[in-house]
Amino acid sequence: VPRWRQQWSGPGTTKRFPETVLARCVKYTEIHPEMRHVDCQSVWDAFKGAFISKHPCNITEEDYQPLMKLGTQTVPCNKILLWSRIKDLAHQFTQVQRDMFTLEDTLLGYLADDLTWCGEFNTSKINYQSCPDWRKDCSNNPVSVFWKTVSRRFAEAACDVVHVMLNGSRSKIFDKNSTFGSVEVHNLQPEKVQTLEAWVIHGGREDSRDLCQDPTIKELESIISKRNIQFSCKNIYRPDKFLQCVKNPEDSSCTSEI
């Protein structure tokens, strides 16, 4: 008789999830000498231990603490780039500007990027059929709790000037309900961070509006200022040109507004 299985609203665990996590860990530790000491089998065991045999709507940050400990990593605190709804450009930027780091440039972020996972209460099985959706099912699911945990720690570590890339094509350029808006903004440490600088990325070719005046950006400025952190904002009108100028800043075309 087939066992009854909970059906969730979200996609199931990414296929070959254990193999993917392990392979990513090995690759990352080979490329980053400062993480060569990491035992990837132990990392996978800690990752698995955070959600296997647990109800996928009842995951806590505490469940991920063994993984957090194994994945402890020091990134330069003044070289942090946060992002919201514009991950690809943020990653393209840090691939060129190698001294800047997004969360996905750290071991733990790299392991989990674009993956989904969940288990089932009281069985050691991984659920490849469905996993809880944050809105439709529950917020304390394995994926959401993981990203909340690592995002909080990443923001807490930041210092000096912190940059955030925001998507100027969205109706809410700054969204209070995004990971940036709900977690990272509130975990920047005012005693360490002097300024948050938003880079608002324009989508349209002929869009010359000052999106730094957008009401949601003003809302972000208000939240940040109340936390005793300075706020600055920069329009990036041509993201393609911006990336070219990061790659080749001496190019004559880079003297005009990006």
Partner: nanobody, 122 residues
Framework: EVQLVESGGGLVQAGGSLRLSCAVS????????MGWFRQAPGKEREFVAA???????LYADSVKGRFTLSRDNPKNTAYLQMDSLKPEDTAVYFC????????????????WGQGTQVTVSS
């Protein structure tokens, strides 16, 4: 070729003010983060303040609340307004440029000016 030229230094009494300027030519100033450093005789070059290409600011604890950074992109110039000056602010002040983001370490800056002397008498 990128050139940085500081001006505005001089002799001032303790409690007084000076405004330093750093004019940039030959480069994409609007993409520069500008840093200010100082060096007193026999001492290491010390970070003072920096401003990003988006005008975000960063100050050393020793000058916070007394010094103010700004930039004028059309004029290709960065400014360091120094108020409530103290004798320990006496040094040669250098401006430096790097692309996009700030840093505290002198080694991260690609372009440097020749420096301008600031002397604060008691």
């Amino acid at each position: 070729e990128v050139q940085l030229v500081e001006s505005g230094g001089g002799l001032v009494q303790a409690g007084g003010s000076l405004r330093l300027s750093c004019a940039v030519s030959g480069g994409a100033f609007n993409n520069f983060a500008m840093g200010w450093f100082r060096q007193a005789p026999g001492k290491e070059r010390e970070f003072v303040a920096a401003i990003t290409w988006g005008s975000g600011t960063l100050y050393a604890d020793s000058v916070k609340g007394r010094f103010t950074l700004s930039r004028d992109n059309p004029k290709n110039t960065a400014y360091l307004q120094m108020d409530s000056l103290k004798p320990e602010d006496t040094a040669v002040y250098f401006c430096a440029g790097k692309y996009f983001t700030t840093a505290r370490l002198p080694a991260e800056y690609k372009y440097w000016g020749q420096g301008t002397q600031v002397t604060v008498s008691s």
